[in-house]
């Protein structure tokens, strides 16, 4: 039959000559063996067919063995996160073998053609594989392959193409242009490993989404919803605008993925929580916190296999930078009535009180108006361990929704700057901890003063019957 | 052991082009990126570009994108950086320099190329 | 661009005292952080790289230490050859940048 054009024809027409007539081709993509922490160390290339580098670099068949994937590259020159990756697996996993994948070669060129070449890169891996396990005490099952952006899609090719399943494929933001809507096969897929765990950071609804929208794994993770990541706005990464352009930002978000998943191996006692939700929206609003019917998970290395499950998306906030942990809380504050509300709609603030620590003061972020004699959902986060909640002071101050509102309430307030007439009546704020699964109902310090002016602060103490304690899994608990 | 050897000094006219070579040794020239840096009287050292000596990629820094060449010879283990449109301010010390396995940080360097630009 | 801004830009100490040197980055480079010395008409010396990782054939009296912005030389008992000048150097994206450099003189 008919040989391909392109690098796949190319490989195959090389592999079907004969052995002496065989021309002297560098190979196109590379296994380098990290058999040293040191960025100095060459590392042992490892060649399809030859035992011995095996054995001269100390590959160790039982011990789980990590193949990391990069993705298109505008530059010839590895990206500094790969060393970050490979550095944090020696750390983690001490016994572990860490193979780069060098596809360099193939990934230097138009996006377009590189994306062509993912398929002979993935049956490339593949190969390697399939040759692995002819190896006494080698398994398929300790196989870990690690793909960022497009690399993600050549795990997912290589996971496809392989004799038996991959243990695990983790795609970090896998790339979006050309993928996105694609078929399974042409695409990383649930069906590529016994697990498939992917972490989203730039996905875009508008314009181009340089990482996948869609869930590609058994569980997919949206850090921060998916998109707009701390510390990678505009005025974080260019510090001036002098010094960079929006490739910044876009690399910034790109490769938090990368960054997380590093979180998760070096920063073992500090694991990230995602939690099971519909959208993006619902998280927002808090409804989502929950562990039960493995609803929650860890993030990154750490994340466990859940089973039945495809394409479950999760969620979570994370700090601008390592580590990423914060502490998820839901809030729900009945609003028991609006007095002389107008057309203002209110924003809350809270401050939260434990035994550890005591955070800032959190805007409570506003997804739907606010509902009058109901119960208000909010999602707060703090970047630092509170320990148990012991109070809650809330403020509110009102927001207009219209110009002619906005002069109405400056000249109200000029006339009249604390405006008494303006209240809501809060009696209790229910809290909800995403991370301990504990449920608390905090009352009013004073029951017969729950009415709260704009400025003013309202005090909530634990109620009475103390802990609300739910039945529900806590994720610290499946920690090892 | 490792070893990067630079061609002569250069005396240049203004809008001349500049070839300086560095021959390596003592490891594998295709498995380390090569740098070049520059160094102008007084000044900071400045990264001008890199390649990856395996298949001859290159990255460069934008502001010497339009004017600098790096290639190489696998043959001859050597690296290659030719600058263009010399100015007077092109008047500098320059390195070829050797990255690690990520080319991060460089451990060997070779002994500088002097290049006047002067009419 | 990332800029780096190192500091002090000349360091006066007497030999045997301890020396410390500073260098910003303008944005988080995490590790990516490399320290080099040079001497007058020779190349640049690798020191420490990946901020705190020692050198085969380098001294131990140099250290080094930080992340994210902020990292730190340490020369804890200057020896008479170690007067030069320090340049840091970020590999975090590119270009690679590197300071402008800190002159370390004897007192």
């Known amino acids: 039959s008919p040989t391909p054009f392109g690098p796949e024809g190319q490989l195959a027409d090389e592999l079907h000559k004969p052995k002496a007539i065989q021309t002297e081709v560098k190979p196109s993509v590379r296994f380098n063996l990290r058999t040293s922490k040191d960025p100095e160390h060459e590392g042992c290339y490892l060649s399809l067919g030859h035992s011995q580098p095996l054995e001269d670099c100390g590959f160790n068949m039982t011990a789980k063995t990590f193949f990391i994937i990069h993705g298109w590259t505008m530059s010839g020159i590895f990206e500094n996160w790969l060393h970050k990756l490979v550095s944090a697996l020696h750390t983690r996993e001490k016994d572990a073998n860490v193979v780069v994948v060098d596809w360099l070669p193939l990934a230097h060129q138009l996006y377009t053609d590189a994306v062509n070449n993912t398929r002979v890169v993935g049956h490339s891996i593949a190969r390697m594989l399939d040759w692995l396990q002819e190896k006494d005490d080698f398994s398929l099952g300790n196989v870990h392959l690690i793909g960022y952006s497009l690399g993600a899609h050549v795990a997912g090719y290589a996971g496809n193409f392989v004799k038996g399943t991959v243990g695990r494929i983790t795609g970090l933001d896998p790339a979006g242009p050309m993928f996105e809507g694609a078929d399974i096969h042409k695409r990383l897929s649930p069906d590529d490993a016994d697990f498939v765990d992917v972490l989203h950071t730039y996905t875009r609804s508008f314009g181009l989404s340089i990482g996948i929208q869609m869930p590609v794994g058994h569980i997919d993770i949206y850090p921060n919803g998916g998109d707009f990541q701390p510390g990678c706005g505009l005025n974080d990464v260019l510090g001036s605008m002098a010094y960079g352009t929006i490739t910044e930002v876009v690399k910034c978000e790109h490769e938090r993925a990368v960054h997380l998943f590093v979180d998760s191996l070096v920063n073992q006692d500090k694991p990230s929580f995602a939690f099971q939700c519909t959208d993006s929206n619902r998280f927002k609003k808090g409804i989502c916190l929950s562990c039960r019917k493995n609803r929650c998970n860890s993030i990154g290395y750490n994340a466990k296999k859940m089973r039945n499950k495809r394409n479950s998306k999760m969620y979570l906030k994370t700090r601008a930078g390592m580590p990423f942990r914060v502490y998820h809380y839901q809030m729900k504050i009945h609003v028991f009535s609006y007095k002389n509300m107008g057309e203002i709609e209110p924003t809350f603030y809270v401050t939260l009180y434990g035994t550890n620590a005591d955070s800032q003061t959190l805007p409570l972020e506003i997804v739907e108006r606010i509902e009058q004699n109901a119960t208000n959902t909010f999602l707060v986060y703090t970047e630092e361990d509170l320990g148990d909640l012991l109070k809650i002071q809330l403020t509110w101050e009102g927001a207009s929704q219209s110009w002619y509102n906005l002069w109405k309430e400056l000249r109200s307030y000029l006339s009249q700057p604390h405006n008494p007439g303006r209240e809501l009546n809060i009696r209790r704020i229910r809290v909800k901890s995403g991370e301990t699964q504990r449920k608390l109902t905090f009352c009013a310090e004073d029951p017969e003063n729950t009415s709260i002016s704009p400025g003013r602060e309202l005090w909530f103490r634990k109620c009475r019957d103390g802990w609300r304690m739910k039945n529900e899994t806590s994720p610290t608990v499946e920690l090892p | 052991q490792v070893q990067l050897v630079q061609s002569g000094a250069e005396v240049k006219k203004p809008g001349a082009s500049v070839k300086v070579s560095c021959k390596a040794s003592g490891y594998t020239f295709t498995d380390y990126t090569m740098h070049w840096v520059r160094q102008a009287p007084g000044q900071r050292l400045e990264w001008m570009g890199g390649?990856?000596?395996?298949?001859?990629?290159?990255t460069y820094n934008e502001k010497f994108k339009d004017r600098v060449t790096i290639t190489r010879d696998t043959s001859a283990s050597t690296a290659y950086m030719e600058l263009s449109s010399l100015r007077s301010e092109d008047t500098a010390v320059y390195y070829c320099?050797?990255?690690?396995?990520?080319?991060?940080?460089?451990?060997?360097w070779g002994q500088g190329t002097t290049v006047t630009v002067s009419s | 661009e990332i800029v780096m801004t190192q500091s002090p830009a000349t360091l006066s100490v007497s030999p045997g005292e301890r020396a410390t040197l500073s260098c910003r980055a303008s944005?988080?480079?995490?590790?990516?952080l490399h320290w080099y010395q040079q001497k007058p008409g020779q190349a640049p010396r690798l020191l420490i790289k990946y901020a705190s990782q020692s050198i085969s054939g380098i001294p131990a009296r140099f250290s080094g230490s930080g992340s994210g912005t902020e990292f730190t030389l340490t020369i804890s008992s200057l020896q008479s050859e170690d007067f030069a000048v320090y340049y840091c150097?970020?590999?975090?994206?590119?270009?690679?940048?590197f300071g402008q450099g800190t002159k370390l003189e004897i007192k």
């Open positions: 320099a050797k990255g690690d396995y990520y080319g991060g940080s460089y451990n060997y």
């Open positions: 150097q970020q590999s975090n994206s590119w270009p690679y940048t």
């Open positions: 390649i990856n000596p395996y298949y001859g990629g290159t």
């Open positions: 944005q988080d480079i995490s590790n990516s």
